[in-house]
Structure formats: structure tokens, C-alpha cells
């Protein structure tokens, strides 16, 4: 039984150019997490495993960076950013566990973060 | 077109070390990362380790217990392999392979390098 | 470390024969697993990975399907050329292994 809950960074809104850190955490539940997906829609941006390390993807090497810990920061960001991410929870034994993230990248200064939440 | 064009084959003695270059062109040689392969004559394929071009981080398969070390020259867009204290059953052909996009497979290989171990 | 296990070792097959080969592993590996044809002195060529997207160029008769831990490799209507080695290998962690490979020779 999957027992775990995905807490995420929520509705977070950056300014054009600027950095965001993208961050889920797996909280409730004692499965082991062996590798976590970062997507943006059906893009894969990067994955974290646990034996291997980062992969980050070719097209996005340049301006993503890993870390802090499973998160991911997108770098030199453009309104083209905005839109939906997830975080995808590899676990073992439980299976997977997805968190989303809306990220809207704002032309002007008046960037600010929105709660955090908890997706079950 | 990407290609991966290794260096020719060695024969090397028994606690001897032996170092395989691997070229990389077609690509942005730091956007992928490096794996390398063997093969020992009619046997399967054998993981190694994998480096990141851009930061010379390595990662390592146990089974060759600190006797791999992996390195690049990024001016050169050149993989290294080394493998130390050699022993007959090291006698393989050896492959760098290029990390998928999406992924820790391996999307193209090099020709390979013949490496035989003997006295 | 997960096990790999590919069968059959071997296959004798015809031209224009479907052939299905497997691969089971130890524990969930999801979707990763890719597939290679190797042919006798060359480097393996990938033809799938998170097992079911086609690589580059790889012609439509072949096909991967599978998760968690029962994988597949079909080849629909066999050609003369696709006669060679075929190894899975997970891409999920260290050490990256390779089943056993299976040889599809010509009955």
C-alpha cells in the first residue's frame, strides 16, 4: 500500500532571466527512492539516481543545474518556461509517486512564491 | 554525424596498465556523458563506469575495484580509459559508449579496442 | 545488484518468421530496459530503450514492450540482416548489466 505523500514547492512564479529551484520532497512513507524524473510535460529534463548520480538532459545541460539535494534549478529562464513540472518518485517497494509544479516565468520584478502543498 | 573513433589495439603483460582513447565529434562533446564497455572474446558485455565530461565526475562498476580510471580532455572532445594491474582475464575488447538523451543507455559506441593480456 | 535474465540463449529462425526473445529481472526496473542487436566483430547498435521507444533508424518490425519486471523484444517479419546477437540491458542503476545475450541464427 502506497502510503506516501509528494510535498512540493507548489505554484512558484520567477522573474525572465533569473533562477528557480524546482524541489519535491517524499515524505509519510519508509520506501527506499531510487530514482527521481524531472519532467516538464512529456520533456524529460533530468534524472537523479540513486547508484548513478544526475543525467541531465543534452538539450537542457546549459541551463539546468542539479540540486540542491533531488531538486533541480532551471537557469537563464524564459516566459517559454512557464508551464507545468513534475517530479517523479521512483520508490522501492512502493512504486511511483508524482508531485506537480507550476512555474510561471514573469517578464517583470514582481516575482513571488506561492504556498507550499501536498499532492497524496 | 556523431562518432566515437577509439584507439588501436594494445598487447600488454600481465600487471602492465593500458590506456584507450576514445574521439568524439558530431556533438557538443560535455552535453553527454561517457560510458565505457568490454566484451572478453565470445562473452557478453560488461558495464565499467561512466564520467561526466563537464565536471570529470565518475561513477565505477565494483567488479574492477579501483583498477579503472576514467578521464577527458574536453579540448580535445577525448574519453580515456584506463585499466591497471592487467591479468589475462582482462584480455577483451573494450568500447566507450555515448549515454542516451533520455537516460543511462547507450545511444552510439565506439569500433572498439582490442586489448589481449599475455606473457 | 539486479539480476538479468534473457531467454532463449539461442534461436534458429527463417526469414519473414516473428521472434519474440525475453528478459526478466530481479526486482522493478519500471520501463528501463533498452535492447541491442550486435553482429559478429562490430559494436553493439541500440535499438530500444525505456523499453519501448525506437532509437534512431531502427525499422518498424522491430518492437519492445514491458515494465516492472518482464520485458520483450519482437521482431515481426525477420530479415537476412537481422541475424546477430541481441542483448537487454536496465538502465535503472549501477551496474548497468546486460542479460546474457541471445544468438538468432538462420534454421
Known amino acids: 500500500m502506497m502510503t506516501g505523500t509528494i510535498e512540493t514547492t507548489g505554484n512558484i512564479s520567477a522573474e525572465k532571466g533569473g533562477s528557480i529551484i524546482l524541489q519535491c520532497h517524499l515524505s509519510s512513507t519508509t520506501a527506499q527512492v531510487t530514482q527521481v524524473n524531472w519532467e516538464q510535460q512529456d520533456q524529460l529534463l533530468a534524472i537523479c539516481n540513486a547508484d548513478l548520480g544526475w543525467h541531465i538532459s543534452p538539450s537542457f545541460k546549459d541551463r539546468v543545474a542539479p540540486g540542491p539535494g533531488l531538486g533541480l534549478t532551471l537557469q537563464s529562464l524564459t516566459v517559454n518556461d512557464t508551464g507545468e513540472y513534475f517530479c517523479i518518485y521512483h520508490t522501492y517497494p512502493d512504486g511511483t509517486y508524482t508531485g506537480r509544479i507550476f512555474l510561471e516565468v514573469l517578464e517583470s520584478s514582481v516575482a513571488e512564491h506561492g504556498a507550499r502543498f501536498q499532492i497524496p | 554525424e556523431v562518432q566515437l573513433v577509439q584507439s588501436g589495439a594494445e598487447v600488454k603483460k600481465p600487471g602492465a596498465s593500458v590506456k584507450v582513447s576514445c574521439k568524439a565529434s558530431?556533438?557538443?562533446?560535455?552535453?553527454?556523458?561517457m560510458h565505457w564497455v568490454r566484451q572478453a572474446p565470445g562473452q557478453g558485455l560488461e558495464w565499467m563506469g561512466r564520467?561526466?565530461?563537464?565536471?570529470?565526475?565518475?561513477k565505477y562498476n565494483d567488479n574492477f575495484k579501483g583498477r579503472v580510471t576514467l578521464t577527458v580532455d574536453k579540448s580535445t572532445s577525448t574519453a580515456y580509459m584506463e585499466l591497471s594491474s592487467l591479468r589475462s582475464e582482462d584480455t577483451a575488447v573494450y568500447y566507450c559508449?555515448?549515454?542516451?538523451?533520455?537516460?543511462?543507455?547507450?545511444?552510439?559506441w565506439g569500433q572498439g579496442t582490442t586489448v589481449t593480456v599475455s606473457s | 545488484d539486479i539480476q538479468m535474465t534473457q531467454s532463449p540463449s539461442s534461436l534458429s529462425a527463417s526469414v519473414g518468421d516473428r521472434v519474440t526473445i525475453t528478459c526478466r529481472t530481479s526486482?522493478?526496473?519500471?520501463?528501463?530496459l533498452a535492447w541491442y542487436q550486435q553482429k559478429p566483430g562490430k559494436a553493439p547498435k541500440l535499438l530500444i530503450y525505456?523499453?519501448?521507444t525506437f532509437a534512431e533508424g531502427v525499422p518498424s518490425r522491430f518492437s519492445g514492450s514491458g515494465s516492472g519486471t518482464d520485458f520483450t523484444l519482437t521482431i515481426s517479419s525477420l530479415q537476412p540482416e537481422d541475424f546477430a546477437t541481441y542483448y537487454c540491458?536496465?538502465?535503472?542503476?549501477?551496474?548497468?548489466?546486460f542479460g546474457q545475450g541471445t544468438k538468432l541464427e538462420i534454421k
Open positions: 559508449a555515448r549515454e542516451g538523451g533520455f537516460g543511462y543507455y547507450f545511444d552510439y
Open positions: 558530431g556533438y557538443t562533446f560535455t552535453n553527454y556523458y
Open positions: 540491458q536496465h538502465h535503472y542503476g549501477i551496474p548497468l548489466p
Open positions: 526486482e522493478n526496473i519500471f520501463t528501463y
Open positions: 525505456n523499453a519501448k
Open positions: 564520467i561526466d565530461p563537464t565536471s570529470g565526475a565518475t
